[in-house]
Amino acid sequence: LECYSCVQKADDGCSPHRMKTVKCGPGVDVCTEAVGAVETIHGQFSVAVRGCGSGIPGKNDRGLDLHGLLAFFQLQQCSEDRCNAKLNLTLRGLNPAGNESAYEPNGAECYSCVGLSREKCQGSMPPVVNCYNASGRVYKGCFDGNVTLTAANVTVSLPVRGCVQDETCTRDGVTGPGFTLSGSCCQGPRCNADLRNKTYFSPRIPPLVLLPPPTTAAPSTRAQNSSSTTSTAAPTTTTSIIKPTTAQASHTSPHEMDLEVIQEEGASLSGGAAGHGGTAGHGGAAGHQDRSNMEKYPGKGGAQIPAKGGS
């Protein structure tokens, strides 16, 4: 089987001339393409992967909402040679994007990372935007998180920052098959420079204090009962509240090495996507087709939006 292969971050990598073809390894009988688009009130971007896949042919479209950050996920798998270029990976212009002057700022101010690389979205480097209320929703919180897409033995991840409706969310996420949008929210001007280590404590909610059991018991029993602690708590704290509904997605540090495109362990190049870089061109039948005429992401109204944290 021969498939198209590319990895897109923001708007490079699946661009027209960068499309590759790869011969899939033995036993691989589907080509795959997956795209995840994230829409903030200040713009949108997408991540995408094309390559040799696994599983069965078919399509999966989903719309997700995380505190006013909208995510659209599409997966398409097919079993013919070079069939994995049917999804439109080009984004249409957002209504508010580029026209923010028409909206009244509500006083909140956040760092904005929309399609920026991890290097450009560190600390206070990214641009600052004024939040505004849109579509009857109040955007007064700031968000710091990641979008991650895994397909064709490749994982691509980009940071996401911007204005959201929630001001206190902690490590919240929404997921689709191989797709995760996760992060934390905060309140205050430019508070979303780095929320990786945000714990579940909130000024409005007193922390849950777990009292140590009486010391008459053997001390070794305490060490084994670690279910009440998680790695999400501050290093010196042994208490945290676990939110079972949230997606426990990794919230990659901007200070870590750039692992935005990761070839999964054990994956051979022939079995996955090759290439590097982000927005994709469209494929399809011969003939000049406008990108705007290609299949669109599911609209906000018609998209299936599961409960927060659901899949």
């Epitope: 708007d11 490079d12 027209p16 590759k20 399609g115």
Partner: antibody, heavy 117, light 112 residues
Framework: EVQLLESGGGLVQPGGSLRLSCAAS????????MSWVRQAPGKGLEWVSY????????YYADSVKGRFTISRDNSKNTLYLQMNSLRAEDTAVYYC??????????WGQGTLVTVTS | QSVLTQPPSASGTPGQRVTISCTGS?????????VHWYQQLPGTAPKLLIY???KRPSGVPDRFSGSKSGTSASLAISGLRSEDEADYYC???????????FGGGTKLTVLG
């Protein structure tokens, strides 16, 4: 109908500057990657520069790096090429081209840039 | 010197089949990047003839076909006509140069 119309070419002295424009119509410009490609008289095609749909990703050929700047104004459906420190070897017909279907699927008619003293 | 190598000229008589080769390297065609072909009629802008190795845009006759193998590609024109007299260029992305590269072009002459 897709149309690309270049303008801004002309005669310039070595070391001088020119700004080329390419007005696009008949397609959603803000969704398209665009490039400049040039052709010296009697010679072959040479890719010059590439810009992504949003303008955030840009590539240049080594021969023009540091001297030429590609940009776009999606609100005006226009692609630009600012050419500084021009040399005699930059003399060519400059085409703007749309990237679609994984290739340059539409080209303008070209604008001639002549660098001579 | 062009990154992709094409013969400078090719010729044939009407009705004949002509093939133009395009040889690249491991950083372009050999890296798996798809190959495109352009036709440039005298005094006009180039026109896309074949994209994605072997696909024809609408309006391009099926006399034109493309193929790719390893680090090279070829364009075949069957049933040659006088209006096919033009320059033909191949193109592909190049990882080393981080941009699309063209062949030097092949001038096709239709004899007789």
């Amino acid at each position: 109908e897709v149309q690309l119309l270049e303008s801004g070419g002309g005669l310039v002295q070595p070391g001088g500057s020119l700004r080329l424009s390419c007005a696009a119509s008949g397609f959603t410009f803000s969704n398209a990657w665009m490039s400049w490609v040039r052709q010296a008289p009697g010679k072959g095609l040479e890719w010059v520069s590439y810009i992504s749909s949003s303008g955030s990703t840009i590539y240049y050929a080594d021969s023009v790096k540091g001297r030429f700047t590609i940009s776009r104004d999606n609100s005006k459906n226009t692609l630009y090429l600012q050419m500084n420190s021009l040399r005699a070897e930059d003399t060519a017909v400059y085409y703007c081209a749309r990237e679609g279907l994984w290739a340059f699927d539409y080209w303008g008619q070209g604008t001639l840039v002549t660098v001579t003293s | 010197q062009s990154v992709l190598t094409q013969p400078p000229s090719a010729s044939g008589t009407p009705g004949q089949r002509v093939t133009i080769s395009c040889t690249g390297s491991s950083s372009n065609i050999g890296a798996g990047y798809v190959v495109h072909w352009y036709q440039q009629l005298p005094g006009t802008a180039p026109k896309l003839l074949i994209y994605d190795n072997n696909k024809r845009p609408s309006g391009v006759p099926d006399r034109f076909s493309g193929s790719k193998s390893g680090t090279s590609a070829s364009l075949a024109i069957s049933g040659l006509r006088s209006e096919d007299e033009a320059d033909y260029y191949c193109a592909a992305w190049d990882d080393r140069l981080n941009g699309p590269v063209f062949g030097g072009g092949t001038k096709l002459t239709v004899l007789g």
